[in-house]
Interface confidence: medium
């Protein structure tokens, strides 16, 4: 009997049916970041390319001022990758002296802002200690999951240090969301 | 009024509706790779299992000669994980002498080939420096994002060094795509 | 002729159409783990929050006793991130003596249990060597892919060492699945 409620379409189907092609969707790609003032203990937000190259927004999903604006309530899959790159972390010098220490780290957070809530909500976080010795380093952090969002919610990607973000290629650092 | 255009199905709905179960989909899993000649500065492509174990292709999504062939235009979610493994990187020997150096690295690229374009398009890249000291190492790189593809586009996964790919288990190294 | 079978909905459409909003979906978030007895050579399963905060289950997708229960056959996208954290791995001490060795490691496995099968099936594995020197460390492992599941299948997340899992924040360690 499973699936019986989804009868051939000449019959009544009460749940609203959707053409998949008209669902809100966006894939944003990295651009060179302008370091901006941000509050202490608050990670800066990345800004993004939304229409050139691989980037697009469609079906009322809009990008403005570092935010993806959710046009319709529903369950969304949200993802981002940020590639970081840096010189040898200071951690290594302390390490070589044989003392344990608080490691350097890189962090990505996908954050939801709801105007009616005073505080942003952290949806996803990827955080990694970086303790490299003797060479430059580079590595990605990838995140992705499904969340129930409301019309008007705004999504952004925050990072622990904007100066470590690899902005050189659109395939290395990106951010996207689509209604399921 | 949102969703009003998706009326009960005895009414006219102009957007083409789809049964989700007949959308093109594929999940490919790793097999032992045969190192092949490839052009200098061009990463070799992996080949894949497409029907045994967890692997499948369905609804006209076909796999042939290292490529997933896109049978229908639309927005696809594309993903891959490659697990790499290796012996101590040479980098470590240089490092121990206390000299910074260009690190060894591992890279995965998901590439789109369009016959009418002379150059492949890199959709996704995960790249990581590897500077390990004194032991074998292993680690995955995961990628996933949504892209607008055209009928006839071909997708492949390229890696920086095919000999470092862990081909031993289908759950460690894989590649997939599905129409949203 | 592509898509011709998906005619305006006053015509006959034989494939069962679905409202997207009523598909089985779940996003589970980390809770503090109670170390439990587990068989040697078998990784322990994590348990999860399923209704507080960002966590939810809907449309007959139920969570019980560490398992997500699949209520309907079909193709599902399944994902998880586990953030691990630990003290300096022992590996580093051995390394400093200049001897190559088997590295410490962290592993996440998404496992499918089918009652009619004697053995669980490993769907996804992320495994990483950890050889840190002189500091605490933390890092995520992310996994996600599409699988064909049957009604009654059960999904769980297993880890190599439950004591290393960062259970402090719902955005750091999570597990989800949704019917495509």
């Amino acid at each position: 009997l499973k699936g019986q409620e989804f009868a051939p379409s000449h019959q009544q189907v009460y749940a609203p049916l959707r053409a998949d092609g008209d669902k809100p969707r966006a894939h944003l790609t990295v651009v060179r970041q302008t370091p901006t003032q941000h509050f202490k203990n608050q990670f800066p937000a990345l800004h993004w390319e939304h229409e050139l190259g691989l980037a697009f927004t469609k079906n009322r999903m809009n990008y403005t001022n570092k935010f993806l604006l959710i046009p319709e309530s529903g369950d969304y899959f949200i993802y981002s990758q940020v590639t970081f790159r840096g010189m040898t972390s200071e951690c290594s010098e302390i390490r070589q002296a044989g003392r344990p220490n608080k490691p350097d780290s890189i962090t990505v957070v996908i954050t939801k802002v709801t105007d009616s809530y005073p505080e942003p909500t952290q949806l996803l976080m990827g955080t990694k200690s970086v303790c490299e010795v003797g060479s430059n380093w580079f590595q990605p952090i990838y995140l992705g999951a499904m969340f129930s969002l409301q019309e008007g919610d705004k999504l952004m990607v925050n990072v622990s240090d904007i100066s470590l973000v690899d902005y050189t290629k659109e395939d290395k650092t990106f951010f996207g969301a689509f209604l399921l | 009024l949102k969703g009003q255009e998706f009326a009960p199905s005895h009414q006219q709905v102009y957007a083409p509706l789809r049964a989700d179960g007949d959308k093109p989909r594929a999940h490919l899993t790793v097999v032992r790779q045969t190192p092949t000649q490839h052009f200098k500065n061009q990463f070799p492509a992996l080949h894949w299992e497409h029907e045994l174990g967890l692997a499948f292709t369905k609804n006209r999504m076909n796999y042939t000669n290292k490529f997933l062939l896109i049978p229908e235009s639309g927005d696809y979610f594309i993903y891959s994980q490659v697990t790499f493994r290796g012996m101590t990187s040479e980098c470590s020997e240089i490092r121990q002498a206390g000299r910074p150096n260009k690190p060894d690295s591992i890279t995965v690229v998901i590439t789109k080939v369009t016959d009418s374009y002379p150059e492949p398009t890199q959709l996704l890249m995960g790249t990581k420096s590897v500077c390990e000291v004194g032991s074998n190492w292993f680690q995955p790189i995961y990628l996933g994002a949504m892209f607008s593809l055209q009928e006839g586009d071909k997708l492949m996964v390229n890696v920086s060094d095919i000999s470092l790919v862990d081909y031993t288990k289908e759950d460690k190294t894989f590649f997939g795509a599905f129409l949203l | 002729l592509k898509g011709q079978e998906f005619a305006p909905s006053h015509q006959q459409v034989y494939a069962p159409l679905r409202a997207d909003g009523d598909k089985p979906r779940a996003h589970l978030t980390v809770v503090r783990q109670t170390p439990t007895q587990h068989f040697k050579n078998q990784f322990p399963a994590l348990h999860w929050e399923h209704e507080l905060g960002l966590a939810f289950t809907k449309n007959r997708m139920n969570y019980t006793n560490k398992f997500l229960l699949i209520p309907e056959s079909g193709d599902y996208f399944i994902y998880s991130q586990v953030t691990f954290r630990g003290m300096t791995s022992e590996c580093s001490e051995i390394r400093q003596a200049g001897r190559p060795n088997k590295p410490d490691s962290i592993t996440v496995v998404i496992t499918k249990v089918t009652d009619s099968y004697p053995e669980p099936t490993q769907l996804l594995m992320g495994t990483k060597s950890v050889c840190e020197v002189g500091s605490n460390w933390f890092q995520p492992i992310y996994l996600g892919a599409m699988f064909s599941l049957q009604e009654g299948d059960k999904l769980m997340v297993n880890v190599s060492d439950i004591s290393l899992v960062d259970y402090t924040k719902e955005d750091k360690t999570f597990f989800g699945a949704f019917l495509l």
């Epitope: - | 493994r85 074998n136 470092l164 | -």
Partner: antibody, heavy 121, light 107 residues
Amino acid sequence: QVQLVQSGAEVKKPGASVKVSCKASGYTFTSYAMHWVRQAPGQRLEWMGWINAGNGNTKYSQKFQGRVTITRDTSASTAYMELSSLRSEDTAVYYCARGYSSAWFDAFDIWGQGTMVTVSS
Amino acid sequence: AIQLTQSPSSLSASVGDRVTITCRASQGISSALAWYQQKPGKAPKLLIYDASSLESGVPSRFSGSGSGTDFTLTISSLQPEDFATYYCQQFNSYPLTFGGGTKVEIK
């Protein structure tokens, strides 16, 4: 077909050097590693070192460090192993063997026929 | 270096017998172990890689198992051409090392 053909038997005096060649055919030489393994009469196999035929990087067993040199000539699809300061205990059959992977060794899938090296005064 | 100890060092068996050879590593080597067959005057031949994967072209009567420190090579039904010496080899860390060998003789 895929094969490795080694040079012929050698007789050397103590203190001399020997250079054994290994010609590859039937596959892309530069896509694999080449290892050298020896076997003294009645003894177990002993790994000496390897070369990444693509980039020429080498790794040697500590036991032979300073005495062994592994090289390759990509134009001739040939690898070479030179062992210097020979002593009587170096009397053995020397094998080249293809490593499927140049990094994480999943064993040696193709072997040469072996070259007998005798060290005798 | 990682030591590999094979047992027995020799065994006598008849055609059709099930034969088991073990290899113990002095420290954990994950699944990084291979098995070879060597006949007198010939080069070794790869049978099993990654502890349990059968090399292409090798008869299915050969199988490998184990992980960590204890490994087994099994010949399910010994054939006349299987009388030879068998070696295990670890490729987990440098230097790569071999076991002492197990000679399988005709009873």
